[in-house]
């Protein structure tokens, strides 16, 4: 019967595990005439059989680590051998067992990591393979430290990475590590592979010696330097060193400033390169940077502070041209006038700041001079003689030196003699009734006229009238402005009404002076007025509870899992449908009822995160009136990109004949995000054929050496394979091809005979 | 002894047809293809077609369609061509042949000739 | 179809001679699929080398055949007087199946 077993010719695949003796037939295919026999041909490695009868079977145990897949061809023939159907690709994967133990490249490993070196930093590798699948727990492996010697206060100072061999400090090690009182550590490490879960695993181990060297790169401590220096520049302030010498140093500016006056050389002294002035900036925060050759950074960036050391470069300024402050007729001895408020842009608490208040003096001199005192430091007028007379002198003029340790400056005090204030505000009616108004009332409008009246003498404080809602708007929905030439008072709205939270409002209104009532003399009913305020309702739109709602998920959701929701409330009381504007990618739906948003697709950081869309909320009924807010979906990075090579390298070329091994440089990039260390690449050769000529070595995380292994090549091009990984988790490998042509050259350049100009290789090696 | 007898020579007129045989033995006359090839006097090889008894399958030179008919007798273990419509451009000698059932694949045994002559 | 080409069509050559007879095919074909046959005058063909370079039954071992792609040939060594006789080389790669159209031996 058809089915599993039998059947036409056809493409098909089949999965068969290693290491098992042959127990069945793999297909018997039928024939259609003319077809009469089958042939078999492609990977079958004497293994795969067909018999002319269409019989496809094996004889003998495969194994994946020979080959993990065998591609196949089968074709139906005639009884003239002339094939007449096919041939068809017949695919056997070989399914992995675990069959193989890891095993690490060396049995002994040194290296060396600076005392201080950042805390997750690799400083060294550790490698094991197994020949078994790495898609499979098989080929999993999972490393460990078994032991750390010495052990201090039972504190580990190395890290692994389970699934890298990257050994790094944990953040003690970063902290304590000290060459000065233990140079060396070993460590003994295992790997096992099925990802470390199984009692079955196969386990290696090797030992890892390690030397603990100085870190030199330290921050410097704080600069003190002094604003305004008459040096001539750069002068050099400090200095940084990195470890080794041929470090790249450079600086950053954290703060973006217009004019960064600081720059560093490639001794790693750092200079000022301009006078700085304080009163411009106190102080700068800026960044020490070492990276290598390739502009990576090296380690952590130091923080460098500068602090600017004040000099008493600034005189004390007076808060206006003229200060005018009013006194009473009657005030009483020692009662404060007011209080001079100069300002000095020196430092803050300091001798360059402090100031001195002196009265030099007073016009006129009547009835005599020294009516006046003012506080030496605070500067507060006080009324110094006697109570004043306004119709013996209506007005004093003050002149007051304002004195740092260095600078005088001179301020200018007018005195009004004012009329007693012992008349209030009254007003010219108690109620002003009942107001009607929409909700929607713009901001701003005038919605109402009040006036009250003092009899105390015009345009002074004892006349002047402020108004004060003094209850019914707790909101802070009203305000009073006031005329000041007729004290009328204009009630404004300043924030929006609302039918739903207050329909109406009693309030209630104070009418007061800014000059304080003679003694005896006190407010009362006449200087209050009410009035009410009625809100009518108007149809509102829904209100979010955010304008910007946020979510942040994995960029590998499930389609249909959760990622966020939204929340809208209608004023009037109305339900809500929801929809989203705006998702041009076609991720997300949202549940018109809930406002649960949901994917509906694959996510994709690397298409760009956040992702940002609109949300409208209308109401169901009423006027469907809607508004908009933001849902923004933060994707947090898979390792889901395999790395690729950074650039395109065309063009690659080596003058032929080769007089020496010649090496070429090459960088690796991934779109996954790397935080703090970068890629981590490692590199190989994609394959086995590939090494007798050429031989690849890691320079850094994203840059790899691709060298010759001899001078014998042809005069054309080579395809290098290059199989990079990314060690994450899962680690992702891509492979990918360097093309590399072997020419003849005229002054270093690949020499071309005329009409062959196409694709010219440009970057010799 | 494997061996391809072929019927004697043929003078026929033209407009007429003719059937040659060809009779197998010394070996399983339904394992193999009977082919047919033409030899026009001081001229090469033509292939014809071929019948493969077994199912009475048989494939012609798209040349020959309509002018060679293949049939086999499995019981008589005997291929037969008939030529139709015959002209003077039929005149030549005709082999049959015997094609392995195997890789490879060719001609390993030959009859020993029919000659067909078309002369009015 | 395939087009068998061969050269020379006539040639003779002297007892003990090296002879070498050549067919291009017009498209390229397995080497296993190209067949020579010897037919002396009033004889039907015999099959001489199959699939390029075998000896079928019988062959003297002077004969040798090569060849691959679109290009093949027949060698005789040493040339001998029984070796006179038509040499026709045969696709049988696919339908039609198609022959040379002859090399003629004769002995010098």
């Known amino acids: 019967q058809e089915g599993k077993f039998s059947g036409p010719l056809k493409p098909m695949t089949f999965s068969i595990y290693e290491g098992q003796e042959p127990s069945q037939i793999i297909f018997q295919f039928k024939a259609n005439p003319p077809a009469v026999t089958f042939e078999l041909t492609g990977e079958t490695d004497n293994i795969f059989v067909i018999e002319r009868e269409g019989l496809l079977y094996y004889n003998r145990a495969l194994d994946r680590e020979t080959r993990s897949t065998h591609n196949l061809q089968v074709a139906a023939l005639d009884a003239n051998g002339i094939i007449v159907e096919g041939p068809v690709p017949i695919t056997i994967k070989v399914k992995d067992i675990n069959d193989n133990r890891p095993t690490f490249l060396q049995s002994k490993y040194e290296g060396s990591v600076r005392q201080n070196s950042r805390p997750g930093k690799p400083f060294l590798y550790v490698n094991a393979t197994d020949l078994d699948d790495p898609a499979t727990p098989n080929g999993q492996l999972y490393y460990q430290i078994v032991i750390q010697l010495p052990m201090i206060n039972n504190v580990m100072y190395f890290q692994i990475n389970n699934k890298t061999g990257a050994i790094s400090l944990t953040r003690e090690g970063s902290q304590e590590l000290n060459p000065a009182k233990n140079p060396s550590y070993n460590l003994v490490i295992s790997v096992k592979d099925m990802g470390g879960q199984s009692e079955n695993s196969f386990s290696d181990t090797t030992s890892v010696d390690i030397i603990v060297t100085e870190n030199i790169w330290k921050a410097p401590k704080p600069v003190e330097m002094v604003e305004n220096s008459t040096d001539p520049h750069p002068i050099k302030i400090t200095q940084v060193r990195w470890n080794d010498p041929g470090a790249q140093y450079s600086l950053v500016d954290k703060e973006k400033l217009p004019r960064f006056p600081f720059s560093i050389d490639q001794e790693g002294d750092i200079y000022v390169t301009q006078p700085l002035d304080r009163e411009e900036k106190d102080a700068y925060v800026f960044y020490a940077v070492a990276k290598d050759e390739y502009g990576k950074p090296l380690s952590y960036p130091l923080e460098i502070h500068v602090k600017v050391k004040d000099i008493n470069d600034n005189p004390p300024t007076c808060p206006s041209p003229v200060t005018v402050f009013e006194v009473q007729e009657n005030e009483r001895l020692g009662n404060s006038i007011g209080t001079l408020t100069a300002h000095d842009r020196d430092e803050e608490n300091t001798a360059n700041s402090f100031l001195n208040y002196r009265i030099v003096e007073q016009t006129p001199k009547l009835p005599m001079d020294g009516l006046f005192l003012i506080q030496t430091y605070a500067g507060m007028l006080q009324l110094a003689k006697q109570s004043l007379k306004k119709q013996d002198t209506p007005q004093y003029n003050l002149t007051i030196e304002v004195s740092d340790k260095d600078f005088k400056t001179l301020c200018f005090v007018q005195i009004n003699v004012i009329d007693i204030n012992d008349q209030i505000p009254i007003f010219e009616k108690s109620d002003y009734g009942n107001l009607t108004l929409a909700e929607d009332t713009n901001i701003g409008s005038t919605i109402l006229t009040i006036q009250a009246t003092d009899a105390d003498e015009p345009f002074t404080g004892s006349s002047k009238i402020l108004y004060h809602i003094i209850k019914g708007d707790s909101e802070g929905r009203l305000g009073v402005d006031t005329d000041p030439h007729t004290n009328t008072g204009y009630v404004i709205i300043k924030k929006p009404l609302d039918f739903e939270t207050a329909a109406v409002s009693n309030i209630v209104f104070k009418a007061e002076n800014p000059e304080p009532l003679v003694f005896g003399v006190k407010y009362n009913a006449s200087s209050f007025a009410k009035f009410t305020l009625i809100v009518t309702d108007v149809n509102e739109a829904p209100q979010f509870s955010q304008h910007v709602f946020q979510a942040k998920v994995s960029e590998d959701v499930a389609i249909g899992t959760k990622v966020g929701n939204v929340t809208a409330k209608d004023p009037e009381g109305l339900d809500i449908s929801y929809s989203l504007r705006g998702d041009t990618r076609g991720w997300l739906k949202i549940d018109h009822v809930t406002g649960e948003i949901f994917s509906v697709a694959p996510l994709d950081r690397e298409a760009g995160s956040p992702y940002r869309v609109q949300v409208v909320a209308t109401e169901v009924g009423g006027s469907s009136l809607s508004s908009v807010s933001e849902f923004h979906l933060i994707l947090m990075d898979v390792n889901d990109n395999p790395p690729r090579l950074a650039k395109d390298y065309t063009g690659l070329f080596f003058c032929h004949p080769l007089s020496a091994p010649g090496s070429l440089i090459f960088e690796a990039t991934d779109d996954d995000q790397h935080l703090f260390r970068g890629p981590h690449f490692t590199f190989s050769l994609g394959s086995g054929s590939l090494q007798n000529d050429w031989e690849v070595s890691k320079i850094n995380g994203t840059h790899a050496r691709l060298s010759t292994r001899h001078t014998e090549f042809e005069e054309r091009e080579y395809v290098v394979l290059i199989r990079i990984n990314d060690g994450g988790r899962p680690p992702l490998e891509g492979i990918v091809s360097l093309p590399v042509t072997f020419c003849s050259c005229v002054e270093g350049s690949c020499f071309r005979p005329a009409g062959h100009q196409t694709g010219i290789p440009t970057v010799g090696m | 002894q494997v061996q391809l007898q072929q019927s004697d020579a043929e003078l026929v007129k033209p407009g007429a047809s003719v059937k040659i045989s060809c009779k197998a033995s010394g070996s399983t006359f339904t394992d193999h293809t009977i082919h047919w090839v033409k030899q026009r006097p001081e001229q090469g090889l033509e292939w014809i077609g071929y019948i493969y008894p077994v199912y009475g399958y048989t494939q012609n030179n798209e040349k020959f369609k309509g002018k060679a008919t293949l049939t086999a007798d499995k019981s008589s273990s005997t291929a037969y061509m008939q030529l139709n419509s015959l002209t003077s451009e039929d005149s030549a000698v005709y082999f049959c042949a015997r094609s392995r059932d195997s890789n490879p694949y060719y001609f390993d045994y030959w009859g020993q000739g029919t000659t067909l002559t078309v002369s009015s | 179809e395939i087009v068998l080409t061969q050269s020379p069509a006539l040639m003779a050559a002297s007892p003990g001679e090296k002879v070498t007879i050549t067919c291009t095919v017009s498209?390229?074909?397995?080497?296993?699929?190209l067949h020579w046959y010897q037919q002396k005058s009033g004889t039907s063909p015999k099959p001489w080398i199959y699939g390029t370079s075998n000896l079928a039954s019988g062959v003297p071992v002077r004969f040798s055949g090569s060849g691959s792609g679109t290009s093949y040939s027949l060698t005789i060594s040493s040339m001998e007087a029984e070796d006179a006789a038509t040499y026709y080389c045969q696709q049988w790669s696919s339908y039609p199946f198609t022959f040379g159209s002859g090399t003629k031996l004769k002995m010098k």
């Open positions: 498209s390229s074909i397995s080497s296993s699929n």
